[in-house]
Amino acid sequence: PEPPTACREKQYLINSQCCSLCQPGQKLVSDCTEFTETECLPCGESEFLDTWNRETHCHQHKYCDPNLGLRVQQKGTSETDTICTCEEGWHCTSEACESCVLHRSCSPGFGVKQIATGVSDTICEPCPVGFFSNVSSAFEKCHPWTSCETKDLVVQQAGTNKTDVVCGPQDRLRA
């Protein structure tokens, strides 16, 4: 049988010796030897390592800078980084969420298809026939035109994607 040419899954090779990696949340202080174990130390406050590793320094937790519109969504641990998100009304400019921009509003004639979140912008859609939006908003969907018939009225002015229909009384002469 062939002898192994590599170490086991959670090990690394150094000086012909297979040493245990340090577990998440810990950094390497000293490699193992033939006679000693790998020495690992927990990461300090505001530091983390999220994988089995042989790093000699832990990574700093991300700082959620309020001057950039950021706030902490999830506090970091020794094994995970801090997750930032944006203040209300703002969203991240990238997946890493390093800065924020104001949510866009949907112009008249467009309605909100999907409301913005801390990580995604507003998605707008044109109001289809039978619907309208007469405001610029980050929340309002397209509204259906008023149904004049259900009010026993008639359409006096047709609706557009920006305006509602105008209803009026029925022409009595037609009776």
Epitope: P4, R8, Q23
Partner: antibody
């Protein structure tokens, strides 16, 4: 320092099952495979299998396939061996032993104190 | 039936040297430096004495040494002492997925 501490003596009837534990300390438990070796009274050492404490993957020698189950609970750094359908010739001292590897070779560097399992009607 | 053959017993007087042999095949002992040796006192767990043919773990006396010639590995104990009286097992690593084959054991008696 590395220590493997095993559970105590067990007396079982033929056909029963037994579970022996091996608690590890002094090293990173998921980083090293754990092996199980048994020794019948007055006999030599017999390798049974290994477990990868990280993934739970196992390898058994043909003789014990189907009758032995190796498990672990990484949260308490403990490995277990379950032997079922016990027979009188399963009477033995069961040892856990940690595997250490170099580039071309692996060997068992630390052993538990052993757990005596007696199978008798 | 062990794949590695050891003599059932050897003996020697204090101060003497003894050698325990372990014979395998060209695919295990002969091919690679895969042999380790374990000492076992009665009622105790085995203890690693030699690995990779001739390497000694920390704390093991330099009176213990290992060697290999062809398909036979050997454990030599020099300056024999009473506490060396024990059972000795050779062991061959048989590949990453099968791992271990033990010899039948050799009882060392210090006269």
């Amino acid at each position: 320092q590395v220590q493997l501490v095993q559970s105590g003596t067990e007396v079982k009837k033929p056909g029963a099952s037994v579970k022996v534990s091996c608690k590890a300390s002094g090293y990173t438990f998921p980083g090293y495979y754990m092996h199980w070796v048994r020794q019948a009274p007055g006999q030599g050492l017999e390798w049974m299998g290994w477990i990868n404490p990280d993934s739970g993957g196992t390898k058994y020698t043909q003789k014990f396939q189907g009758r032995v189950t190796l498990t672990r609970d990484a949260s308490v750094s403990t490995a277990y061996i379950d032997l079922n359908r016990l027979r009188s010739d399963d009477t033995a001292v069961y040892y856990c032993a940690r595997e250490r590897c170099r580039t071309t070779n692996c060997y068992l560097d630390y052993w538990g104190q052993g757990s005596l399992v007696t199978v008798s009607s | 039936q062990s794949a590695l053959t050891q003599p059932a017993s050897v003996s020697g007087s204090p101060g003497q040297s003894i050698t325990i042999s372990c014979t395998g095949t060209s695919s295990d002992v002969g091919n690679y430096n895969l042999v380790s040796w374990y000492q076992q006192h009665p009622g105790k767990a085995p203890k690693l004495m030699i690995y990779e043919v001739n390497r000694r773990p920390s704390g093991v006396s330099n009176r213990f040494s290992g060697s290999k010639s062809g398909n036979t590995a050997s454990l030599t104990i020099s300056g024999l002492q009473a506490e060396d009286e024990a059972e000795y097992y050779c062991c061959s690593y048989a590949g990453r997925d099968t791992f271990v084959v033990f010899g039948g054991g050799t009882k060392l008696t210090v006269l």
